[in-house]
Interface confidence: medium
Amino acid sequence: LNTTILTPNGNEDATTDFFLTSMPTDSLSVSTLPLPEVQCFVFNVEYMNCTWNSSSEPQPTNLTLHYWYKNSDNDKVQKCSHYLFSEEITSGCQLQKKEIHLYQTFVVQLQDPREPRRQATQMLKLQNLVIPWAPENLTLRKLSESQLELNWNNRFLNHCLEHLVQYRTDWDHSWTEQSVDYRHKFSLPSVDGQKRYTFRVRSRFNPLCGSAQHWSEWSHPIHWGSNSSKENPFLFALEAEQKLISEEDLGGEQKLISEEDLHHHHHH
């Protein structure tokens, strides 16, 4: 079973401290080699993937991950129980919902089991690393002759999210963007009845419950108006682009070690 786990790149909003221990030696030993950085993302507060670049190791190494929460009731060191693999080498760890405490400082330690002194520790603020699922169930309703209202749902995290709405008409080359607060509702006051509109939304865990920088995936687009992509080259281009973006996202493959919680995979 090859289940792909998608993990966005970058962890710029994490507060990171590294502690590297090396054996004193005259020649360069394995223990002096830096360990790869661990990047963690909390997907919709349903599970968390902490991943690292296993290919940065000079030779294939099954690095191990331990974690705990600093200055809390959950400060007991825990072993990863659910490793992610890339080409049969550990490249990440998946933590389930019950193991995630957003508002406690998460400490993650990567270690080379063959060189126990070779280890790196990072401290992360998980509330800044939440990535929500894409908004769902987009609906449009006409408020008046020329006014449209767009509504959508987010699974679980409603009041914690801000949103970005993009819309364009058939013949627009680029999107118009509008930020929306936690109310997940957007009104377009002036609609041209002769044009077909496309709307899409993405969401971010910011600012009420955290300060995440990463947006969700875009929602599936919703359309208003008469034309179809068969009549409009820009909509065809948009649909074809979406296929490209999906393929690009599937570029870096990471496989799950076990079959549990597969329904939690990061969907598009």
């Epitope: 080359h173 992509s229 068969k230 080259p233 065809f236 281009a237 074809a240 682009e241 296929k243 490209l244």
Partner: antibody, heavy 114, light 107 residues
């Protein structure tokens, strides 16, 4: 007027390098994925590369992977194709195009021969 | 990779003829198929996108149909300027691939 203009083709020896340029005008360049397609003399069309709108994602055909690289400068409305380790079988007319082929450049001929 | 096979490779026809070119895909590509016309020494020109949508400025004698794995380009009444090569291309899967082309010549 919407157009793409390629330049940089010419004669090069096997193993040599060449850089093709594609200048865009008449449309919002950074709103479009862009592609490179080539056509060997008397042969059909072969897609060789695409680049995303912001230039952060590129894909290449197996026939050129590791030898060719494409990049773009949205501020200058320009696209380029760097071709290294050229082979005789790379001889072709090279076209840049908007990503689903609605606008093409006029093409530039690259000849790889000793 | 998805293979596109065009048929016929060569076609001899007269002005006024109805001409049909077929493009088969080795797997389902939905409607992500385009058709081009190319004249000697020129860049290809987009005729049809999304399998059946006529590109702006293309004469209505050109039409496309099909979905999935079988597609056709039809020229309802061949004109002198239509003698050229025609290519299909799929955009459903990377790498994008072209058919081998169909050359339409004067009988």
């Amino acid at each position: 007027q919407v157009q793409l203009v390629e330049s940089g083709g010419g004669l090069v020896k096997p193993g040599g390098s060449l850089r093709l340029s594609c200048e865009a005008s008449g449309f919002t360049f950074n709103d479009f994925y862009m592609t490179w397609i080539r056509q060997a003399p008397g042969k059909g069309l072969e897609w060789i590369a695409y680049i995303s709108k912001s230039g952060d994602k590129m894909r290449y055909a197996d026939s050129v992977k590791g030898r060719f690289s494409t990049s773009r400068d949205n501020a200058k409305n320009s696209l380029s194709l760097q071709m290294n380790s050229l082979r005789a079988e790379d001889t072709a007319v090279y076209y840049c195009a908007r990503f689903y082929g609605d606008i093409w450049g006029q093409g530039t001929l690259v000849t790889v021969s000793s | 990779d998805i293979q596109l096979t065009q048929s016929p490779s060569f076609l001899s026809a007269s002005v006024g003829d109805r001409v049909t070119i077929t493009c088969w895909a080795s797997q389902d590509i939905s409607s992500f198929l385009v058709w081009y016309q190319q004249k000697p020494g020129k860049a290809p020109n987009l005729l049809i996108y999304a399998a059946s949508a006529l590109q702006s400025g293309v004469p209505s004698r050109f039409s496309g149909s099909g979905s999935g794995t079988e597609f056709t380009l039809t020229i309802s009444s061949l004109q002198p300027e239509d003698f050229a090569s025609y290519y299909c291309e799929q955009l459903n899967n990377y790498p994008w691939t072209f058919g081998q082309g169909t050359k339409v010549e004067i009988k």
